[in-house]
């Protein structure tokens, strides 16, 4: 039975040209995290594997940095980066947990972080 929950940074906003950290945290389970996949809509951004470490998709290498932790840092943000991001936690023995983050990249200097929220 899957008992864990994914806590994410929720709905967040950031300025164009700036950077943002996407963070998810898996709690309420003793399952071992074997791999975390980060996706932007339908696009694989990066993989963090417990044994092999990080793999950043080559097409994002210039603007995506691993970490901190299992999170992902997006740099040189553009308006086109606005959208949904998913952290997919592959665990043993539980299976797969998915968290969702919505990022809005703003033209103005008014960019506030949304409240943290949980996805069961």
């Amino acid at each position: 039975m899957m008992t864990g929950t994914i806590e994410t940074t929720g709905n967040i906003s950031a300025e164009k040209g700036g950077s943002i950290i996407l963070q998810c945290h898996l709690s309420s389970t003793t399952a071992q995290v074997t791999q975390v996949n980060w996706e932007q809509q339908d696009q694989l951004l990066a993989i963090c594997n417990a044994d092999l470490g990080w793999h950043i998709s080559p097409s994002f290498k210039d603007r995506v940095a691993p970490g901190p932790g299992l999170g992902l840092t997006l740099q040189s943000l553009t308006v086109n980066d606005t959208g949904e991001y998913f952290c997919i936690y592959h665990t043993y023995p539980d299976g797969t947990y998915t968290g969702r983050i919505f990022l809005e990249v703003l033209e103005s200097s008014v960019a506030e972080h949304g409240a943290r929220f949980q996805i069961p």
Epitope: T34, N37, D42, Q43, L44, N49, D51, L52, S59, Y92
Partner: antibody, heavy 119, light 107 residues
Framework: EVQLLESGGGLVQPGGSLRLSCAAS????????MTWVRQAPGKGLEWVSA????????YYADSVKGRFTISRDNSKNTLYLQMNSLRAEDTAVYYC????????????WGQGTLVTVSS | DIQMTQSPSSLSASVGDRVTITCRAS??????LNWYQQKPGKAPKLLIY???SLHTGVPSRFSGSGSGTDFTLTISSLQPEDFATYYC?????????FGGGTKVEIK
């Protein structure tokens, strides 16, 4: 240099058994998932089975479930495929391949070993 | 199971030609799509992974694109050593499945 070397293929009668081996070298074997893929004569590729780096998770195609067992011995850097209740339609070249990431790609392949099931 | 449909099943082309092979998934597989090259009597070789990433050592004339259900492998200028059979593979879900293959032959 990554190397994968399959062995154990041969001629077997329907209903018989075979155990294929895949000896790995040139990388930290226990850190990588491994996969078996087969190819019937003149046909395309068919995914057969996969196993995680530590062997805790295994996966099978419906066509072999309950008959084939994938396993690994990380102390020997060797992957296995135990094939029981073999059928004529299992006749194929069997390849082992290294899969670096879960839901990932097979980046290095062995040369294959031929299994022929015939009476 | 996710069905992978490749087209064409075979094609004839000349050295220097631009060649495009398509692969369609029966459902959304995001970018969990790989391309392999296989020559007769040899093991497959990885060309492209995650839809568009070029595997180490693969010539830059090979490129991949697409996401969701529709994917393309392009060889920008066909070379003599490129005559082979090409397969797409989805690794989005178990069982992983391959397309039926595209045989690229000399015209």
């Amino acid at each position: 240099e990554v190397q994968l070397l399959e062995s154990g293929g041969g001629l077997v009668q329907p209903g018989g058994s075979l155990r294929l081996s895949c000896a790995a070298s040139g990388f930290t074997f226990s850190s990588y998932g491994m996969t078996w893929v087969r190819q019937a004569p003149g046909k395309g590729l068919e995914w057969v089975s996969a196993i995680s780096g530590r062997g805790s998770s295994t996966y099978y195609a419906d066509s072999v479930k309950g008959r084939f067992t994938i396993s690994r011995d990380n102390s020997k850097n060797t992957l296995y495929l135990q094939m029981n209740s073999l059928r004529a339609e299992d006749t194929a070249v069997y390849y082992c391949a290294r899969t670096p990431y879960r839901s990932g790609w097979a980046d290095y392949w062995g040369q294959g070993t031929l299994v022929t099931v015939s009476s | 199971d996710i069905q992978m449909t490749q087209s064409p099943s075979s094609l004839s082309a000349s050295v220097g030609d631009r060649v495009t092979i398509t692969c369609r998934a029966s459902q959304n597989i995001k970018t969990y799509l790989n391309w392999y090259q296989q020559k007769p009597g040899k093991a497959p070789k990885l060309l492209i992974y995650a839809a568009s990433s070029l595997h180490t050592g693969v010539p830059s004339r090979f490129s991949g694109s697409g996401s969701g259900t529709d994917f393309t492998l392009t060889i920008s200028s066909l070379q003599p050593e490129d005559f082979a059979t090409y397969y797409c593979q989805q690794t989005y879900s178990i069982p992983q499945t391959f397309g039926g293959g595209t045989k690229v032959e000399i015209k």
